[in-house]
């Protein structure tokens, strides 16, 4: 029979591969059927009988066509600093990712093995590089003429306001305070109302996190603990 119409199990022609969704069984020396995702090989094929497949039991899975004797165990439940983004089913493993405000310090094949809180930049320091799903926030000291008065994982250094007459000069952790008889300017909600400066600074939007890539399909080696960067709080 031509290979296209042979039924499994069959002996392949010398130099030929098995066909779609088949594997070569070394013991039987035959091409045999694989089991579909969500199943495993309950009984391996012989020269006269094909693979017998069975469904994966609860909390186990196979994601690929296979001839494994047992399904894989789903990963343990997600920890409190994680969210379950994919449930454990017969065809897929559970995937845990870090909840907002955390990043993945140690990836696994899919999802995250270990989450860590995003670094917070203390007053006098602003966010130089935002955190992503897989990288921590990087803080930098506020340059002359800029300040940050918050402890935050998102706030950047903002320019001091420019005054006609300076009451209190700004520094890295505080805005300048102006002296003026002009009416007070309207501020952003929650901001302290200060006397009107000569020119109001433009609103500075927070940097948006750069898009992060999907978790690596290779296992990452765990790295030793690193000290917090300057200007961060070990929160």
């Amino acid at each position: 029979l031509p290979a296209q119409v042979a039924f499994t199990p069959y002996a392949p022609e010398p130099g030929s591969t098995c066909r779609l969704r088949e594997y070569y069984d070394q013991t039987a020396q035959m091409c045999c059927s694989k089991c579909s995702p969500g199943q495993h090989a309950k009984v391996f094929c012989t020269k006269t009988s094909d693979t017998v497949c069975d469904s994966c039991e609860d909390s186990t899975y196979t994601q690929l066509w296979n001839w494994v004797p047992e399904c894989l165990s789903c990963g343990s439940r997600c920890s409190s600093d994680q969210v379950e983004t994919q449930a454990c089913t017969r065809e897929q493993n559970r995937i845990c990712t870090c909840r907002p405000g955390w990043y993945c310090a140690l990836s696994k094949q899919e999802g995250c093995r270990l989450c860590a809180p995003l670094r917070k930049c203390r007053p006098g320091f602003g966010v130089a590089r935002p955190g992503t799903e897989t990288s921590d926030v990087v803080c930098k000291p506020c340059a002359p003429g800029t300040f940050s008065n918050t402890t935050s994982s998102t706030d950047i250094c903002r320019p001091h306001q420019i005054c006609n007459v300076v009451a209190i000069p700004g520094n890295a952790s505080m805005d300048a305070v102006c002296t003026s008889t002009s009416p007070t300017r309207s501020m952003a909600p929650g901001a302290v109302h200060l006397p009107q400066p000569v020119s109001t600074r433009s609103q500075h939007t927070q940097p948006t996190p750069e898009p992060s890539t999907a978790p690596s399909t290779s296992f990452l080696l765990p790295m030793g603990p690193s000290p917090p960067a300057e200007g961060s709080t070990g929160d």
């Epitope: 290979a3 066909r19 066509w65």
Partner: antibody, heavy 119, light 107 residues
Framework: QVQLVQSGAEVKKPGASVKVSCKAS????????INWVRQATGQGLEWIGW????????QFNENFQGRVTMTRNTSISTAYMELSSLRSEDTAVYYC????????????WGQGTTVTVSS | DIQMTQSPSSLSASVGDRVTITCRAS??????LNWYQQKPGKAPKLLIY???KLHSGVPSRFSGSGSGTDFTLTISSLQPEDFATYYC?????????FGGGTKLEIK
């Protein structure tokens, strides 16, 4: 990144043979089938066959059986497709493509090699 | 061999349109239906496999549906880069076979 790079264009006379190469990079060459697919000018796509680089075993479309030879050199991650007894209707662009044998798709393609058969 | 028939063979549409291309197999192919996009002078690119699974990097405006013998590729809102020729391909039985293609042109 994962890519397949093919050899350059060929012009052959009827009855001759042509051998096209396909160099893989960015993945483990021996773990995926390399398929060959051709496309005549302005026409659709036609599957020729595949080679499994790990052992060199092949699977062919019966329309090409006896005229096509597929080989590989694992040390340089390169697959070859040789088509013999060429005729004018073999004039086409020949593509190599990485294949998935469970779902029968081609996820990475070479840039194509134009083979012209003309007397 | 399994014959794959695409319709229409050509189609004119505008940016923003919703477009549907159909593919019919001469016999049951379960869900083993793949879709490709090809631009002139370029190799085909895999869009969708196993009827509806989106290949990595493919925009979510592409979707696939159907089962058995009748399948559809839908582009929810056409973008300028979507004007190309689309091919279906069955992955159920050897030999692997392709549809004749649907050329999507700008109206």
């Amino acid at each position: 990144q994962v890519q397949l790079v093919q050899s350059g264009a060929e012009v052959k006379k009827p009855g001759a043979s042509v051998k096209v190469s396909c160099k893989a990079s960015g993945y483990t060459f021996i773990t995926y089938d390399i398929n060959w697919v051709r496309q005549a000018t302005g026409q659709g796509l036609e599957w020729i066959g595949w080679i499994y680089p790990r052992d060199g075993n092949t699977q062919f479309n019966e329309n090409f059986q006896g005229r096509v030879t597929m080989t590989r050199n694992t040390s340089i991650s390169t697959a070859y497709m040789e088509l013999s007894s060429l005729r004018s209707e073999d004039t086409a662009v020949y593509y190599c493509a990485r294949g998935d044998r469970d779902y029968g798709y081609f996820d990475v393609w070479g840039q194509g090699t134009t083979v012209t058969v003309s007397s | 061999d399994i014959q794959m028939t695409q319709s229409p063979s050509s189609l004119s549409a505008s940016v923003g349109d919703r477009v549907t291309i159909t593919c019919r197999a001469s016999q049951d192919i379960s869900n083993y239906l793949n879709w490709y996009q090809q631009k002139p002078g370029k190799a085909p690119k895999l869009l969708i496999y196993f009827k509806s699974k989106l290949h990595s990097g493919v925009p979510s405006r592409f979707s696939g549906s159907g089962s058995g013998t009748d399948f559809t590729l839908t582009i929810s809102s056409l973008q300028p880069e979507d004007f190309a020729t689309y091919y279906c391909q069955q992955g159920n039985t050897l030999p692997l076979t392709f549809g004749g293609g649907t050329k999507l042109e700008i109206k």
